[in-house]
Interface confidence: low
């Protein structure tokens, strides 16, 4: 016997209190698949999160981070503070890259300069806090 709830499309829920009729998801909730018996509460992008995509009856809201922060984790589950290029985020806050390392982004950690001599090449352009070394011909 077919489950009558299987006829309920995304954006609705199968309301057992009302003879298994397909009822629309209430505001601020959604169902992304058919046949659901409840609608899920929409994610709210608050504080350091901002709304990238509004919640609809069939899909959850999507958040990103306010300026000065960037997303971390699946679905932007966390916002992490940006640093300047040439810095990395530590427990003590943003710190300049140590000599011999660089970071050309506002996120992530400082990486060591390319060691040109390992490939038998000369250094064409020296590395800085913000950029990698550029190797010349051997």
């Amino acid at each position: 016997l077919q489950d009558p709830c299987s006829n309920c499309p995304a954006g609705t829920f199968c309301d057992n209190n009302r003879n298994q009729i397909c009822s629309p998801c209430p505001p601020n909730s959604f169902s992304s698949a058919g046949g659901q018996r409840t609608c899920d509460i929409c994610r709210q992008c608050k504080g350091v999160f901002r709304t990238r995509k509004e919640c609809s009856s069939t899909s959850n809201a999507e958040c990103d981070c306010t300026p000065g922060f960037h997303c971390l984790g699946a679905g932007c589950s966390m916002c992490e503070q940006d640093c300047k290029q040439g810095q990395e985020l530590t427990k003590q806050g943003c710190k300049d890259c140590r000599f011999g390392t660089f970071n050309d982004q506002k996120r992530g950690i400082c990486q060591p300069w390319t060691n040109c001599s390992l490939d038998g090449k000369s250094v064409l352009v020296n590395g800085t806090k913000e950029s990698d070394a550029v190797c010349g011909p051997s």
């Epitope: 006829n7 954006g11 998801c25 505001p27 009856s57 069939t58």
Partner: antibody, heavy 117, light 107 residues
Framework: QVQLKESGPGLVAPSQSLSITCTVS????????ISWVRQPPGKGLEWLGI???????NYNSALKSRLSISKDNSRSQVFLKMNSLQTDDTARYYC???????????WGAGTTVTVSS | DIQMTQSTSSLSASVGDRVTISCSAS??????LNWYQQKPDGTVKLLIY???SLHSGVPSRFSGSGSGTDYSLTISNLEPEDIATYYC?????????FGGGTKLEIK
Amino acid sequence: QVQLKESGPGLVAPSQSLSITCTVSGFSLTTYAISWVRQPPGKGLEWLGIIWPGGGTNYNSALKSRLSISKDNSRSQVFLKMNSLQTDDTARYYCARGAGTWYFDVWGAGTTVTVSS
Amino acid sequence: DIQMTQSTSSLSASVGDRVTISCSASQGISNYLNWYQQKPDGTVKLLIYYTSSLHSGVPSRFSGSGSGTDYSLTISNLEPEDIATYYCQQYSKFPWTFGGGTKLEIK
């Protein structure tokens, strides 16, 4: 630009059936629901039914036995069929887009159907 | 079925007036209420959804409020183009139902 346009026969004889088409543009029927609403002359609005993006339907219980709503996503058309028409089915018939499924954010201009012999 | 009652079928007001149109449900509808405007030519537009959320492009002079069974639409500064019939609609339970409408005229 989002638009809905109803097209119907204008005149229907009593006991015959009614077919109205709602042709939409500017959005896809795979992501929006469409409802049908009618308005008899000098009276208020009456909700007839809805067809969901996935093709499921809900109907006004008072008219359910006479009503059928279907659609063709590829042609962007929704169809209202009503049988056993009587004179009190004379009305302007509207299709409306269901945004978020629970409110009608864009309406067609309506098509007038007169049931008379 | 849930009955929606708009107790005032018509009302007359002057340009600049504050006008309130009421709507009552036969049972609680948990704020699941919309308001529509129908112009004399039959054109229908959404004004307010979920009791108090203003639809995009609708002037801010329109506002909605209410809870339980009693709801209202307020036009704070009546303009000549607001001549229309206003309908409430519940979507708490199928079949979705409309109020009988309130026809607004300018004095």
